[in-house]
């Protein structure tokens, strides 16, 4: 066959669908690889061809569109399963071609099983809610295009295994689930089950997402440096190890990049010649506020090192702060036999 632009296996689009449920999968060529849409391609005389490779096989084979009840069908740039079966798992390829042009891409499709409480290997999207906010909503995801607007589906919401009814601050409102004054106890997996009729059959769509209640922007503050501070002096003798922790609290802020760094005499540690190491640890509160600790370490500190300026810096979307550590050379304790004796006038 003539040359074809092969975009390879698009593992970025690891598509997971539930067994025994409808699935509509758009050919990724038009969404991510080509600059024109399906309608334009079709008008230009290009044909979209689908084929697949079964799990643990190397052989590409055409998709059987002649199954009973049209279980697998194609509509424009969408491959339909009504419904999926476990052995539909594999790599699917869509190819757009005519006599002079060819472009194709493959993508993995995994059909997964779920238990009666909706647990499965499915990777779940995470929806963040702000703590104590008035009303926040999540929407049953990825159900567009499954049924026409004239069809009125029934939607049932679950938290974990339990149907949501008479939950105090969680209210089902059709495709939406409203949270009134969210608390951390609202954390968990929420599932919507959408049931709709089609050609005398009833189909179910199951969608689960994880809700995580996070710190509210109204409570957010600029970074707070807990250490170094004015109460602790790092007093060392030359040759000792100098350890200075920089501990910074960051309020949760959506999409904020939290940074902590040290400067020594105004320079980054990488830009100076002394042998310094920096170790970082990060911990999170239940509302995803973050505490970062960077420990600056000089194994054998010199007199010169003890005269330097060590400053901890922190930055978030809320602002930038800095704090200098108090470092000084320890005055050696007097040796009694010599110094004190001299002090008493002994010779």
């Amino acid at each position: 066959s003539e040359r074809c632009d092969d975009w390879g296996l698009d593992t970025m689009r690891q598509i997971q669908v539930f067994e025994d449920e409808p699935a509509r999968i758009k050919c990724p060529l038009f969404e991510h690889f080509l600059k024109f849409n399906y309608s334009t391609a079709h008008s230009a005389g290009l044909t979209l061809i689908w084929y697949w490779t079964r799990q643990d096989r190397d052989l590409e084979e055409p998709i059987n569109f002649r199954l009973p009840e049209n279980r697998i069908s194609k509509e424009k740039d969408v491959l339909w399963f009504r419904p999926t079966l476990l052995n539909d798992t594999g790599n699917y390829t869509c190819m757009l071609r005519n006599t002079t042009y060819c472009s194709k891409v493959a993508f993995p499709l995994e059909v997964v099983q779920k238990d009666s409480c909706f647990n499965s290997p499915m990777k779940l999207p995470v929806h963040k809610l702000y703590i104590e906010y008035g009303i926040q909503r999540i929407t049953c995801p990825n159900v567009d295009g499954y049924f026409p607007s004239s069809v009125k589906p029934t939607i049932t919401w679950y938290m974990g295994c339990y149907k949501i009814q008479n939950f105090n601050n969680v209210i089902p409102e059709g495709m939406n689930l409203s949270f009134l004054i969210a608390l951390i106890s609202n954390n968990g997996n929420y599932t919507c089950v959408v049931t709709y009729p089609e050609n005398g059959r009833t189909f179910h769509l199951t969608r689960t997402l994880t809700v995580k209640v996070v710190g509210s922007p109204k409570n957010a503050v600029p970074p707070v440096i807990h250490s170094p501070n004015d109460h602790v002096v790092y007093e060392k003798e030359p040759g000792e190890e100098l350890l200075i922790p920089c501990t910074v609290y960051f309020s949760f802020l959506m999409d904020s990049r939290n940074e902590v760094w040290w400067t020594i005499d105004g320079k980054k540690p990488d830009d100076i010649t002394i042998d310094v190491t920096i170790n970082e640890s990060i911990s999170h509160s239940r509302t995803e506020d973050e505490t970062r600790t960077q420990i600056l370490s000089i194994k054998k500190v010199t007199s010169e090192d003890l005269k330097r300026s060590y400053v901890c810096h922190a930055r978030s979307a809320k602002g930038e702060v800095a704090k200098a550590a108090k470092v000084k050379q320890k005055v050696p304790a007097p040796r009694y036999t010599v110094e004190l004796a001299c002090g008493f006038g002994a010779t």
Epitope: I131, I184, S185
Partner: antibody, heavy 118, light 107 residues
Amino acid sequence: EVQLLESGGGLVQPGGSLRLSCAASGFTFAEYAMNWVRQAPGKGLEWVSAISYDGEGTLYADSVKGRFTISRDNSKNTLYLQMNSLRAEDTAVYYCARFRYYTAFDYWGQGTLVTVSS
Amino acid sequence: EIVMTQSPATLSVSPGERATLSCRASQSVSSNLAWYQQKPGQAPRLLIYGASTRATGIPARFSGSGSGTEFTLTISSLQSEDFAVYYCQQYNNWPWTFGQGTKVEIK
């Protein structure tokens, strides 16, 4: 200094209505969820209602749902409780209380007495 | 709704002695539990939040412990001003609920 001052209590007949107010000062009122908590004579504390800092989210105890409405006016630093269809069992001292998830009900008003009696 | 049960209903203690008050939740409330003190004719006053953190201005003789379903308020050495009713309250789940109270009286 944080202060919460309730008003509007009094004697009302069963089936009647009353509107309680709570004037807040000494803090940024618009940043806090606010609540009403009540205490019947000689009894314990009962949470009645909560409202989010922006006034959008409201929650009620089952015992008052459909009869009481909580609201707030952040421009006036004032919290309200509209009480309709009052019953004898609503007789209590009503407190307004400031709430933040991290510190619970950290400040309370001195309370206002509502008596429902014929 | 989560039911909070306090024990004992009344605790008779001599000044200077230690008082231990218990609070049990009908299901886990994590560490989202507060303790309040109420004296006759006064509003409740926050003592402890987050099960173990003392509120601003509360003396060190008050301490809280526990998590999940079992919580304790300890007053290490009772002063005359500590004789009052103490309430626990969960703020983990709506509706927020209080215990029925423990009255600490002079023995």
